[in-house]
């Protein structure tokens, strides 16, 4: 970390590039095991033969797609975030559920409800959750629209979470909203149904407040298409959490060196 | 950057802390001059005697306050951002100007207009601008309100820029909005009057859409108070830009080593 | 920036991001990571010269601060600037898991 | 985090942020910066041990990766993590200028 003065212009020193690569590879071996809190590679004895299940591949692809769109300038990494996060997804409550009845004639918004017991199954304790994203697949659209996301708050009130300007698109497109704080709070409450509202941004002079965005698995004109409603493309929560068994280790002394 | 293997656990090496400090101080000497593109410290021969002008101190304090509230996790720094930025401010067009006439009976919004020739005087060329902030001093308030900022777009249309949840406050409080893109756009256009609208967040079911926030130097009930209107606390643009004479150097080869 | 676009297409001797693809099976002897089969880890390498200076050298040195010692370190080091995460799929017993590992891919470097 | 809160109140031998106040007049012999009179620049110092390992050492080494080599560098270095800007006031001729210098104050360090 501190070198001799004569090292200032050490371009003359020849670098054994292969040695540096070998060191980097060995360091990565340790890094991956350490991030997964494994002392050695896991045994493959019980791994079922054949390809990975489709649901697992879909989840892997969701995560990979998210990474590709993510800023490459990470926040400084708190200790807990150094370790690997298990990725799971929780689909929204099926559109045929009676809970959607009251919302179906509202033109400025669409609604998505989630069962907190499903979320708790994936993330048993609030502090284990490191990120939650609401992911919606927007169908192709030729209009631009400013939209907003709200959280169901109490009986008839909604809390503003964020907004997005959606530009026209020729292909279906995944939208992602960070809802970590909301899901953490749901985990801090009893089980039940919680929800989000996805709305047009309404202007103060109330002209056209209709939501022109269609979301896969939700938009009214597709409600009869059960193929779409039941597939993996309906809105879901992508959850990243420290697995329970890994959490215990996080509390050993931080600076014990 | 790459050390011998025996250096891996180099805790045994004694560090001359004083030497490291001296090196760091010398490096900072070079860093500051380099960021200001000075080959040597500027001559102080013409500096007027006495304390700094009050307007300069106010500007320095505005900048210092902004730094204190700023995230300490910077983005990776593009080359142009390495160099020092001159800080100036441009006050909004005086409230007595006829341009405000049409806006004074609108309860959901307040309006702030700026003369682009004043902005161009501070930043002669669009690429020189590295950051522009709209700063408003909000007066004390016991209510919470969700507010939005818009940019005047064409004759009667407004473009959404951002929003903020304003919590109650016992003391006046500065609000700051990043409007770099907007001001850069203005600099790319001809001279004229351009403006912002600061509005209540209006709900789709239009209940109370009145703006309950009072802004120093703007809010209607204070319009007669010229002391407040003309002081340094009325809305202004805080501009950070590369001085013209320094900009010439930025176009030498990036990686000439 | 000393990023993959610049560094992979130049013969920069000083601090830059260097190409390194890791194949889990070939390089680490691991068969337990089912997806991906490998990844572009990359790494930072190269000196950060002109680390500090005496007045006499200013004219030569000042122009080089920006790249070689922007943080005015007593002894600058070539380190990652932008990093990206890596999702993986592996099995624990019979159960497949998707996990995300933070800060695994080096996209750019800096003298710090 | 290896930040001022932790490092200034401990006797950490490894990588940490170290206190350094620079008085422009006393330390640099400069009278031309009118505001501020000086600033807490700080700096990063200390080794990042356990930089890479062979299989035999894993049990000992893995728990230390988090602090000592989180980025799996071939040779980790103690460098700034969080930085803050510094505004200054100085004169060019008769004209006072307020300028902001980016990334001047070290708030925390990391092994990178």
């Amino acid at each position: 970390d501190y070198k001799d003065d004569d090292d200032k212009l050490s371009t003359s020193k020849t670098i054994d590039m292969e040695l540096v690569k070998r060191k980097r590879i060995e360091a990565i071996r340790g890094q991956i095991l350490s991030k997964l809190r494994l002392a050695s590679p896991p045994s493959q004895g019980e791994v079922p033969p054949g390809p990975l299940p489709e649901a697992v591949l879909a989840l892997y692809n969701s995560t990979r797609d998210r990474v590709a769109g993510e800023s490459a300038d990470p926040e400084p990494e708190p200790e807990a975030d150094y370790y690997a996060k298990e990725v799971t997804r929780v689909l929204m409550v099926d559109r045929n559920n009676a809970i959607y009845e009251k919302t179906k004639d509202i033109s400025h918004s669409i609604y998505m409800f989630f069962n907190t017991s499903d979320i708790r199954e994936a993330v048993p304790e609030p502090p284990l959750l490191s990120r939650a994203e609401l992911r919606l697949q927007r169908l192709k659209s030729s209009v631009e629209q400013h939209v907003e996301l709200y959280q169901k708050y109490s009986n008839n009130s909604w809390r503003y979470l964020g907004n997005r300007l959606l530009t026209p698109t020729d292909t279906p497109e995944w939208l992602s909203f960070d809802v970590t704080g909301v899901v953490r709070q749901w985990l801090n409450q009893g089980d039940g149904i919680q929800g989000f509202r996805f709305s047009a941004h309404c202007s103060c002079d109330s002209k056209d407040n209709k939501l022109h965005v269609e979301i896969n698995g939700i938009s009214p004109k597709r409600r009869g298409d059960l193929g779409t409603i039941h597939d993996m493309n309906r809105p879901f929560l992508l959850l990243m959490a420290t697995p329970l068994e890994r959490a215990q280790h996080l509390h050993s002394s931080r600076h014990r060196r | 950057d790459y050390k011998d293997d025996d250096d891996k656990l180099s805790t045994s090496k004694t560090i001359d802390m004083e030497l490291v400090k001296r090196k760091r101080i010398e490096a900072i000497r070079g860093q500051i001059l380099s960021k200001l593109r000075l080959a040597s410290p500027p001559s102080q021969g013409e500096v007027p005697p006495g304390p700094l002008p009050e307007a300069v101190l106010a500007l320095y304090n505005s900048t210092r306050d902004r730094v204190a509230g700023e995230s300490a996790d910077p983005e990776p720094e593009p080359e142009a951002d390495y160099y020092a930025k001159e800080v100036t401010r441009v006050l909004m067009v005086d409230r007595n100007n006829a341009i405000y006439e049409k806006t004074k009976d609108i309860s959901h919004s307040i309006y702030m207009f700026f003369n682009t020739s004043d902005i161009r005087e501070a930043v002669p060329e669009p690429p020189l601008l590295s950051r522009a902030e709209l700063r408003l001093q909000r007066l004390k308030s016991s209510v919470e309100q969700h507010v939005e900022l818009y940019q005047k777009y064409s004759n009667n249309s407004w473009r959404y820029l951002g929003n903020r949840l304003l919590t109650p406050t016992d003391t006046p409080e500065w609000l700051s909005f990043d409007v770099t893109g907007v001001v850069r756009q203005w600099l790319n256009q001809g001279d004229g009057i351009q403006g912002f609208r600061f509005s209540a967040h209006c709900s789709c079911d239009s209940k109370d859409n009145k703006l309950h926030v009072e802004i120093n130097g703007i809010s209607p009930k204070r319009r007669g108070d010229l002391g407040t209107i003309h002081d340094m606390n009325r809305p202004f643009l805080l501009l950070m830009a590369t001085p013209l004479e320094r900009a010439q150097h930025l176009h030498s080869s990036r990686h000439r080593r | 920036a000393l990023d993959t676009n610049y560094c992979f297409s130049s013969t920069e001797k000083n601090c830059c991001v260097r190409q390194l693809y890791i194949d889990f099976r070939k390089d680490l002897g691991w068969k337990w990571i089912h997806e991906p089969k490998g990844y572009h880890a990359n790494f930072c390498l190269g000196p950060c010269p002109y680390i500090w200076s005496l007045d006499t050298q200013y004219s030569k040195v000042l122009a080089l601060y920006n790249q070689h010692n922007p943080g005015a370190s007593a002894s600058p080091c070539c380190v990652p600037q932008a990093l990206e995460p890596l999702p993986i799929v592996y099995y624990v017993g019979r159960k497949p898991k998707v996990e995300q590992l933070s800060n695994m891919i080096v996209r750019s470097c800096k003298c710090s | 985090a290896l930040d001022t809160n932790y490092c200034f109140s401990s006797t950490e031998k490894n990588c940490c942020v170290r206190q350094l106040y620079i008085d422009f007049r006393k330390d640099l012999g400069w009278k031309w910066i009118h505001e501020p009179k000086g600033y807490h620049a700080n700096f990063c110092l200390g080794p990042c041990p356990y930089i890479w390992s062979l299989d035999t050492q894993y049990s000992k080494v893995l728990a230390l990766y988090n602090q000592h080599n989180p980025g799996a560098s071939a040779s980790p270095c103690c460098v700034p993590q969080a930085l803050e800007p510094l505004p200054i006031v100085y004169y060019v001729g008769r004209k006072p200028k307020v300028e902001q210098l980016s990334n001047m104050i070290v708030r925390s360090c990391k092994c990178s």
Epitope: E79, P124, P126, G181, R184, L187, N188, G190, L250 | - | - | -
Partner: antibody, heavy 117, light 110 residues
């Protein structure tokens, strides 16, 4: 429903101590529990907490010297080792407001620990 | 680390007046914030959770607001009984913290 802390005492520097929190009218099996301390004339300081299923979480300064455990469905303990004068405080135990929460709706009256030679 | 900074440290208010206490988190805590009241010789009492939800039995003159990193507790129509020290607590992060509580604000009622 109530909580009561016990085990506070005058102890010498370097000693260890175990504080106990006992519940009446409810069981810990469906609540998070935490320990918080308050030095004389000072603010509240979070020490750590234990979840419904027994996972423990600690403040960074408390790791290693403080241990929280559930010893039965109605008692939770806090063990402190290597006590110093800086540990002199009233120690509170607190229960989550609702079953899964880690904000604290029910508090005990506190037990005073004094460390002095 | 997630640090909570509370301001002011102390405030004086007349009966019937309004008092505003601010709490700033060093990072976004997504509204996962609670407020407590503590009187001398007593344990703290939960007033508000999730930034603005009133705990049961708490009078409506206590109002919480805010999001992201900035939160506010407002007490309107202050009564003598409101003289106490008030603390904010983040419950977003439980392990990467030195203290989940803010430093406290003493409210003196005149």
């Amino acid at each position: 429903q109530s909580l009561e802390e016990s085990g506070g005492d005058l102890v010498k520097p370097g000693a260890s101590l175990t504080l106990t929190c006992t519940a009446s009218g409810f069981s810990f099996s469906s609540y998070w529990m935490s320990w918080v301390r308050q030095a004389p004339g000072k603010g509240l300081e979070y020490i750590g907490m234990i979840s419904i299923i027994g996972t423990t979480y600690y403040a960074s300064w408390a790791k290693g010297r403080f241990t929280i455990s559930k010893t039965s469905s109605t008692t939770v303990t806090l063990q402190v080792t290597s006590l110093t004068a800086a540990d002199t405080a009233t120690y509170f135990c607190a229960r989550g407001y609702v079953s899964n929460s880690n904000y604290w709706g029910l508090w005990g009256p506190g037990t005073l620990v004094t460390v002095s030679s | 680390a997630y640090d909570m900074t509370q301001t002011p440290a102390s405030v004086e208010v007349a009966v019937g007046g309004t008092v505003t206490i601010k709490c700033q988190a060093s990072q976004n805590i997504g509204s996962n914030l609670a407020w407590y009241q503590q009187k001398p010789g007593q344990p703290p009492k939960l007033l508000i959770y999730y930034a603005s939800d009133l705990a049961s039995g708490v009078p409506s003159r206590f109002k919480g607001s805010g999001s992201g990193t900035r939160y506010t507790l407002t007490i309107s129509g202050v009564q003598c009984d409101d003289a106490a020290t008030y603390y904010c607590q983040q419950y977003w992060s439980s392990s990467n913290v030195d203290n989940t509580f803010g430093g406290g604000t003493e409210v003196v009622v005149k």
